[in-house]
């Protein structure tokens, strides 16, 4: 049994890091493999992650971590029984994939203005809380070409757009994702989408 593709990990910079790897053949990850991880710090204890299958030869493990900060570095050991298959390290702050924003809501009752709001996925004491920027994707269910991205580069988790910038009388969907420049993160997954019917009063022709 050998590792074909070494583990690569990403952290949500809060409580979970996800590691994925591939074996050289079909593997029952949860019964045959264990991923041990330990913070390089005083008093830290070794933890064991039981991987799940991710395709025939692929495995994925969700590592639980407390109080993740930029100074943290973890040792990783992948075991098959008594055999050490791979040894490496992982610094969560250098491989961040933020959590997806939540609670995306479209407020349509604001005088021909659409107000989209969502929730920051981090608590205020997390460093990423004040460093997320967002991308909002709005698209028409009827017209695949009517697809737009709004970049929200301020901290407020909201976006205002004129309803008239979208077509009236049809349904739209929106979703939002986040990233943080400070840690050069990847984009988060998209939030669940929300749907609304766009209608506004056309201005009177003169």
């Amino acid at each position: 049994m050998k590792v074909l593709q070494e583990p690569t990990c990403v952290s949500d910079y809060m409580s979970i890091s996800t590691c994925e790897w591939k074996m050289n053949g079909p593997t029952n990850c949860s019964t045959e493999l264990r991923l041990l991880y330990q913070l390089v710090f005083l008093l830290s204890e070794a933890h064991t992650c039981i991987p799940e299958n991710n395709g025939g030869a692929g495995c994925v493990c969700h590592l639980l971590m407390d109080d993740v900060v930029s100074a943290d570095n973890y040792t990783l050991d992948l075991w098959a029984g008594q055999q050490l298959l791979w040894k490496g390290s992982f610094k969560p702050s250098e491989h961040v994939k933020p959590r997806a924003p939540g609670n995306l809501t479209v407020h349509t009752n604001v005088s021909d203005t659409l107000l989209l709001t969502w929730s920051n996925p981090y608590p205020p004491d997390n460093y990423l809380y004040n460093h997320l920027t967002y991308a909002v994707n709005i698209w028409s269910e009827n017209d695949p070409a009517d697809f737009r991205i709004y970049n929200v580069t301020y901290l407020e988790p909201s976006l205002r757009i004129a309803a008239s910038t979208l077509k009236s009388g049809i349904s739209y969907r929106a979703r939002v994702r986040a990233w943080a420049q400070c840690y050069n993160t990847t984009w988060s997954e998209w939030s669940p989408s929300t749907k609304w019917h766009n209608s506004y009063r056309e201005p009177f022709e003169q």
Epitope: F41, L42, L43, E45, D66, D67, V69, S70, A71, D125
Partner: antibody, heavy 116, light 111 residues
């Protein structure tokens, strides 16, 4: 919000022991390390040791080895620091502080006076 | 005896800028992360800067930190009378067993 509430001031005689408590609230107690530091009157900060509330393991500054004991009670989210064989030089304000590589939150401090 | 050396005192007038240095070695500042703590008179220390240059929420951007080699610097701009306090740098010794270190402390006087 995070709070670290320490026990009140103590006056002890040389050779005695003192046990200072630090009750934590506003966060997951077992998820954060707790440090103890002290500050003698008019002096700087001095690190004493650290406890991992999750398993109760400890590490102490060499200067205090054999004289200090740090414990925790997860049922009350409280950590304790006991210092024995007290001498006059141990007169100081003792602080608990939450954190790992840096100390996010500090208790208000407990003044321990050692005097005959 | 701390191995992190700070000037005993610094002073400046309101509105001015002041810097506080923290000098260490390759086994501490040179190989670890620096934090800074503010201790107002009669109170407990408060985290001001961590991870060399990051501010906890609620700390104004008048406070900034930097690190170069084996020394670190805390800068305070737009000095206010309320900034008068003792300031301590902190880091970790990584030579044998890891343990935290505090600097000798600097008394800031706002003239």
């Amino acid at each position: 919000q995070v709070q670290l509430v320490q026990s009140g001031a103590e006056v002890k005689k040389p050779g005695a022991s003192v046990k200072v408590s630090c009750k934590a609230s506003g966060y997951a107690f077992t998820s954060y390390y707790m440090h103890w530091a002290r500050q003698a009157p008019g002096q700087g900060l001095e690190w004493m040791g650290i406890i991992n509330p999750s398993g109760g393991s400890t590490s102490y500054a060499q200067k205090f080895q054999g004289r200090v004991t740090m414990t925790r009670d997860t049922s009350t989210s409280t950590v304790y620091m006991e210092l024995s064989s007290l001498r006059s030089e141990d007169t100081a304000v003792y602080y608990c502080a939450r954190g790992k590589w840096w100390l996010y939150n500090w208790g208000k401090g407990t003044l321990v006076t050692v005097s005959s | 005896q701390s191995v992190l050396t700070q000037p005993p005192s610094v002073s400046a007038a309101p509105g001015q800028k002041v810097t506080i240095s923290c000098s260490g070695g390759s086994s501490n500042i040179g190989n670890s992360y620096v934090s800074w703590y503010q201790q107002l008179p009669g109170t407990a220390p408060k985290l001001l800067i961590y991870d060399n240059n990051k501010r906890p929420s609620g700390i104004p951007d008048r406070f900034s930190g930097s690190k170069s080699g084996t020394s670190a610097t805390l800068a305070i701009t737009g000095l206010q009378t309320g900034d008068e306090a003792d300031y301590y740098c902190g880091t970790w010794d990584t030579s044998t067993t890891m343990y935290p270190l505090f600097g000798t402390g600097t008394k800031l006087t706002v003239l």
